[in-house]
Amino acid sequence: SQVSQNCHNGSYEISVLMMGNSAFAEPLKNLEDAVNEGLEIVRGRLQNAGLNVTVNATFMYSDGLIHNSGDCRSSTCEGLDLLRKISNAQRMGCVLIGPSCTYSTFQMYLDTELSYPMISAGSFGLSCDYKETLTRLMSPARKLMYFLVNFWKTNDLPFKTYSWSTSYVYKNGTETEDCFWYLNALEASVSYFSHELGFKVVLRQDKEFQDILMDHNRKSNVIIMCGGPEFLYKLKGDRAVAEDIVIILVDLFNDQYFEDNVTAPDYMKNVLVLTLSPGNSLLNSSFSRNLSPTKRDFALAYLNGILLFGHMLKIFLENGENITTPKFAHAFRNLTFEGYDGPVTLDDWGDVDSTMVLLYTSVDTKKYKVLLTYDTHVNKTYPVDMSPTFTWKNSKLPNDITGRGPQ
């Protein structure tokens, strides 16, 4: 049902869902701090623009009595319960920030007449794609899928001269929320990834994965998995690996690779790590400031959600337009706004665009090095290292099928 919004007469409220079930185990206090920091920035920006308005956030906490698994498994109804609470209290703001779980976002979107924008730090699954009033500020599964297909097809780089059309996907059910939905998208038989590949098999047991590493009859040399280096080590250990195996480790929200003193462990030599660039902006378009890698994490997405709302509020107020309209609800897409650590671009469907980075381990230095970058906004790969010091033969990525000639 329609809920009146606290969103007019110079007073604009943001409803922040503080759910017990969350995509990442981030203390709610940290999220609150991120939101409050975002509010300070927004107030300053509005004031600088000569807009004398009030912007506040209301934090809506779940009672945690029923939905207490702490992860996303029991989140489906928690979001709806919180919406009911908001409805009963007549406390809906101009915008809803949260939920982060795919299950809850999907259900809330399905079961409510959303005439207000929803901003999510998460909601990674394909089921949350193409939602007209939903904005996602962490890379959704669709973006990963498009990178993988682009990379598989690439065959004109000095270090990748074969198109690939096969893959194993390791998915054992213990993944974090982001990994769960990334791998889910790769597994789905109707997804773009599955459609573009000739062969794809999901490995669900540790032993299946371990056997493939030296199996002469394997159907692909490429294995995709999701998690950090420690997760891979627990699975692979110091087992021997055939020389033409390539493991693609998807680890988007982890900037440990960009710490200066990091040495890649030996078990990472057959691995390409896909992660997010730790920041791609030259402050003030100059090199005068030392750029330190920023954590692209959950709390930052909450903070950027507040900044996005501030950006849209400013535009609508400056144009003398009403905030409680479908036009406002549908406006949170196809734009670039000033995020906490630089410009943030949203695509036509309100999903964040980013620069993904593919890292390899140099056999010379045992350090992580950038092999290529990928811009999700234009679906384009940009090689960086034209003569990588790979572990693979001739410093080139092998064919995906052993013994097959040039494609």
């Epitope: 090199f287 005068s288 030392n290 890698p293 350090k367």
Partner: nanobody, 123 residues
Amino acid sequence: QLQLVESGGGLVQPGGSLRLSCVTSGFTLDDYAIGWFRQAPGKEREGVICLTSGGLPKYADSVKGRFTISRDNAKNTVYLRMDSLKPDDTAVYYCAASGATSRWNCPPQYDHWGQGTQVTVSS
């Protein structure tokens, strides 16, 4: 002795492309950050792109999506690929190197500079 030599500049029409090269000697690219700068007539020199020693590109907002950087350690060369060129991109382009104190950050200043190559975008 550490040296940087740029080449590849020239006259190009708006919307066109160029690839600049910076051939280095006297040091290993793995240990240095490389920056491309430009200076238009009557203007201050500005940073365009930096490639950290770990290989992470960082772009100025004005060129993001149009310019890309890559390196070939085997040839001791760093490339600046410039697409969708505009008249505003007309300048002398310099490459510069700095011994890396951080593998993933651009240095605040550069110690070694090339002599520059002229890029003119005009119809």
